[in-house]
């Protein structure tokens, strides 16, 4: 960066090199060049010469003033016009940054994705700070009172092997940057209550010719959790509103869910699950598309083969659930 150049003087910023966005700032340049009394001192921002708000302070120093500085980053350097020099002489440079102090982190969430071996903690960092902001995640055992701290720039994965202080913990997040520091409320967790089952995946779909044609969705999860509640949502791709079916599921076999759908329409399906009675859901699975046939032939769609047509007969046992209408997004 500009900060690594060899200097023949000094450049500094008031109030500081990192400052709150929208502040008035002064950039000072002081030349220290052998046998060069600068006739003029020039400032450059991102390589472009500044022409206004420059004041000569004394023989070797000038000040550049900015009102309401809003750029997140800028490279500043200054030069001197030395007598008998055809080119300006570089004095020094500095990278400057503006931004905001961190907001109080909120919506602190910690989950254990089944088989991951990690507890993943996330939070809402609030508004963009524009400057380097670090987060310290504090994890304190309620049984041993031992506290561990983890430094990160965003979320954190904590190995469950390192959580040796029993099952109950307090978790909170400290956010800090050059402009300030804030701390979240404490979240109390029990490790057994924050497990999210292994991802549920829709593998294929087929529409069976019957008196009333029906579509069967095949889906599965590798979870070992016995009591799992799932939701499947679906809609025509032209619609805004999701329909949601709820299931109490046992994943000892592939799940099959039946739907009575309109012919010749492209539908999209997603599924998600949670351990029954617990707080956290999986994220919705990736979109699975299926187009119902115009008339009676059987149609099969497979995951990641969107809009493909396959023939073949399958007899299946069907999981049925409760149908609701859903405008919800992904619920954590």
């Amino acid at each position: 960066g500009i900060t690594n150049i060899n200097c023949s003087g000094h450049i500094w910023v008031e109030p500081a090199t990192i400052f709150k966005m929208g502040m008035n700032i002064s950039i000072y340049c002081q030349a220290a060049i052998k046998n060069c009394q600068p006739r003029k001192l020039h400032f450059y921002k991102n390589g472009i010469k500044e022409r206004f708000q420059i004041t000569r302070i004394n023989k070797t120093t000038a000040r550049l003033w900015y009102k309401n500085f809003l750029e997140p980053h800028a490279s500043m350097y200054c030069t001197a016009e030395c007598p008998k020099h055809f080119q300006e002489t570089l004095i020094c440079g500095k990278d400057i940054s503006s931004g905001y102090p961190p907001d109080i982190p909120d919506e602190v969430t910690c989950v254990i994705y089944e088989y991951s071996g990690n507890m993943t903690c996330t939070w809402n960092a609030g508004k963009l700070t524009y400057i380097d902001t670090k987060y310290v995640v504090h994890v304190k055992s309620l049984e041993t009172e031992e506290e561990q701290q983890y430094l990160t720039s965003s979320y954190i994965n904590i190995s469950t092997d390192s959580l040796q202080g029993g099952k109950k913990y307090l978790v909170w997040v400290q956010a800090a940057n050059a402009l300030g520091m804030e701390e979240s409320k404490q979240l109390q967790i029990h490790l057994d209550d924050i497990v999210i089952p292994s991802a549920a995946v829709i593998s294929r779909a087929e529409t069976i010719n019957a008196t009333v044609p029906k579509t069967i969705i095949y889906w599965d999860s590798q979870t070992t959790i016995e009591k799992v509640s799932c939701e499947m949502r679906y809609k025509a791709t032209t619609n805004q509103t999701w329909n949601v079916k709820e299931f109490d599921t046992n994943f000892t076999y592939v799940q099959q869910s039946e739907f009575y759908l309109e012919p010749n329409i492209k539908y999209v399906f997603q599924v998600r699950c949670q351990e029954t009675g617990k707080r956290y859901w999986q994220p919705w699975s990736s979109l699975f598309f299926h187009k119902t046939p115009e008339t009676v032939p059987q149609v099969t769609s497979k995951a990641f083969q969107h809009d493909t047509w396959n023939s073949g007969l399958t007899v299946a046992s069907i999981s049925t659930g409760h149908l609701t209408s859903d405008n919800r997004g992904d619920i954590g």
Epitope: I33, Q37, K40, I57, K59, P83
Partner: antibody, heavy 117, light 107 residues
């Protein structure tokens, strides 16, 4: 173009003080490094002191360290050289000069100061 | 302090002559050397700066050379207006110092 105009000749008694002015035009005083050089009758040039831009300070020749004071008034772009406790061998022409990359490109016209009882 | 020694202290020459004046520094001054011409009752005038750079407006018959401790001012073909006293001056370190001068006289 820099122009340096000095104050007029002076006659001083031994032990007295003097102050020679040097008015700058063409540039501001903040854009120039003013030095002072003197020349006794029939003798060579002798550097007295001036502003050092590399270190941001006024420096003086050791011979004059205790007796000379260089000051500036940036509001009038005038530089001053004061010399106290004058002796007869301080009789000289005193020049202000604008330093320009290790040399003096611009000089004042000189001020003759005669120290005589 | 750095001592500057000029030689010769005076030189008699005719118009058209080549004149060489030398200046020796008591310690190395890189190329921080200037040469001046001074005529009676006038302020000095810079001829050469940084040992070999010709000051704007100065005739090309004047040239400077050298670095470190030994420096030379050469007037390739002396003209009537060149009869004057010449000084060298170092600007490597404070206090800046002048040579004692070389007077170029008409032979």
């Amino acid at each position: 173009q820099v122009q340096l105009v000095q104050s007029g000749a002076e006659v001083k008694k031994p032990g007295a003080s003097m102050k020679v002015s040097c008015k700058v035009s063409g540039y501001t005083l903040n854009e120039l490094s003013i030095h002072w050089v003197r020349q006794a009758p029939g003798k060579g040039l002798e550097w007295m002191g001036g502003f050092d831009p590399e270190h941001g300070e006024t420096v003086y020749a050791q011979n004059f360290q205790d007796r000379v004071t260089l000051t500036e008034d940036t509001s009038t772009d005038t530089s001053y050289m004061g010399l106290n406790n004058l002796r007869s061998d301080d009789t000289a022409v005193y020049y202000c000069a604008a330093e320009s990359y290790g040399d003096y490109e611009f000089w004042g016209q000189g001020t003759l100061v005669t120290v005589s009882s | 302090d750095i001592q500057m020694t000029q030689s010769p202290s005076s030189v008699s020459a005719s118009v058209g002559d080549r004149v060489t004046i030398t200046c020796r520094a008591s310690q190395g001054i890189n190329n921080w050397l200037a040469w001046y011409q001074q005529k009676p009752g006038k302020a000095p005038k810079v001829l050469i700066y940084t040992a070999s750079s010709l000051q704007s407006g100065v005739p090309s018959r004047f040239s400077g050379s050298g670095s470190g401790t030994d420096f030379t001012l050469t007037i390739s073909s002396l003209q009537p207006e060149d009869f004057a006293t010449y000084y060298c001056q170092q600007a490597n370190s404070h206090p800046w110092t002048f040579g004692q001068g070389t007077k170029v006289e008409i032979k």
